[in-house]
Interface confidence: medium
C-alpha cells in the first residue's frame, strides 16, 4: 500500500501508469503544504477500494485530472 501517515507526505511510492477513469471511485488532490512539499494525488479504485498514489507530473495523470474536472463541470448546474 503506497500510503503512510508516519512520514510527512502521504504517498511513499507513486505510479506513472494511466488510470481508467471508469475505474475511479474517488480522486483526492492534496496541495503542497508545510507538512509535504509536493502535490499528492490519491486515487481510490472502485474495485476493492484500493488506494493508489499517482504522479502529478505524468502526462497520463494530467489528462485524467482534465477529464475528471470536465466531467464534474458537466454535472454541476
Amino acid at each position: 500500500v503506497p500510503l503512510s501517515r508516519t512520514v510527512r507526505c502521504t504517498c511513499i511510492s507513486i505510479s506513472n501508469q494511466p488510470v481508467n477513469p471508469r475505474s475511479l471511485e474517488k480522486l483526492e488532490i492534496i496541495p503542497a503544504s508545510q507538512f509535504c512539499p509536493r502535490v499528492e494525488i490519491i486515487a481510490t479504485m472502485k474495485k476493492k477500494g484500493e488506494k493508489r498514489c499517482l504522479n502529478p507530473e505524468s502526462k497520463a495523470i494530467k489528462n485524467l485530472l482534465k477529464a475528471v474536472s470536465k466531467e464534474r463541470s458537466k454535472r454541476s448546474p
Epitope: 506513472n16 501508469q17 488510470v19 481508467n20 484500493e50 505524468s58 489528462n63
Partner: antibody
C-alpha cells in the same frame, strides 16, 4: 538490457484460440504498462489496447473489444494476449510494446509474433 | 478518437536527398507525437518522441518539428540504410493512433 521476448509463430484453424506471451527482462515489470499492436500483412500498425501491470486492469481499443483478452503473470514478468474465435482476418503480426508511461510513447517493442489463421 | 493522416503513403528518393513526411492530427495533440522506423520483418524502432526529441543513438540526420495539428519528420540526407516504412504515433490521450505509414524507397 531491456528486452521484450515474444512467443513463437502460431498456425491456427478458424474458431480456435491463440495465446501469445511477452516476457520482459532488464527492468521492473510493474513499472510500465504493456500495450499490444497488430499489423496485418502489408498493412500499417494498429493499437489494440493496454494492460496496467500494477493492477492487471486491461483497456481495449474499440476494434478489439470482445474476443481479445490481456492478462499478466507478474511472478514471471510476462504479459499475455489471448484471441478467441479466430478468423482469417486475424492473420497478422502481433507486437507487445512497453509504454514509457511518464510520457506515453512506446520505447521498447517485442520482436513480434506471427499468427496465421487458415483452414 | 484522434485520427492521424500521414502523407505521402510512399516516396522514392536518391541517396543524399532531403526527405520530408507529414502527419496531420484531427485535433491539437500538444506536441505528443513520436516517429518510428520499421524495416521488413522487424519491429518498429523509436526514432523521435515529443515532436523533436531524438532517441539516444539515433543519427542527427533525423529530425522532427511541428505543433498543434501539423507535424513533420525529416531526413536531412538520405542514406541507403534509411530504406524502411515510417510511422507517426499520437500519444496525447489514452487512445493511441498511428499514421498509415510512409514507405521510403531509393531511386
Amino acid at each position: 538490457e531491456v528486452q521484450l521476448v515474444q512467443s513463437g509463430a502460431e498456425v491456427k484453424k478458424p474458431g480456435a484460440t491463440v495465446k501469445i506471451s511477452c516476457k520482459v527482462s532488464g527492468y521492473t515489470f510493474t513499472d510500465y504498462s504493456m500495450h499490444w499492436v497488430r499489423q496485418a500483412p502489408g498493412k500499417g500498425l494498429k493499437w489494440m489496447g493496454w494492460i496496467n501491470t500494477e493492477t492487471g486492469e486491461p483497456t481495449y481499443a474499440d476494434d478489439f473489444k470482445g474476443r481479445f483478452t490481456f492478462t499478466l503473470d507478474t511472478s514471471t514478468s510476462t504479459a499475455y494476449m489471448e484471441l478467441s474465435s479466430l478468423r482469417s482476418e486475424d492473420t497478422a503480426v502481433y507486437y507487445c510494446a512497453r509504454n514509457y508511461d511518464y510520457d506515453g510513447y512506446f520505447d521498447v517493442w517485442g520482436q513480434g509474433t506471427t499468427v496465421t489463421v487458415s483452414s | 478518437d484522434i485520427q492521424m493522416t500521414q502523407s505521402p503513403s510512399s516516396l522514392s528518393a536518391s541517396v543524399g536527398d532531403r526527405v520530408t513526411i507529414t502527419c496531420k492530427a484531427s485535433q491539437d495533440i500538444n506536441k505528443y507525437i513520436a516517429w518510428y522506423q520499421q524495416k521488413p520483418g522487424k519491429a518498429p524502432k523509436l526514432l523521435i518522441h515529443y515532436t523533436s526529441t531524438l532517441q539516444p543513438g539515433i543519427p542527427s540526420r533525423f529530425s522532427g518539428s511541428g505543433s498543434g495539428r501539423d507535424y513533420t519528420f525529416t531526413i536531412s540526407s538520405l542514406q541507403p540504410e534509411d530504406i524502411a516504412t515510417y510511422y507517426c504515433l499520437q500519444y496525447d490521450n489514452l487512445l493511441f493512433t498511428f499514421g498509415q505509414g510512409t514507405k521510403l524507397e531509393i531511386k
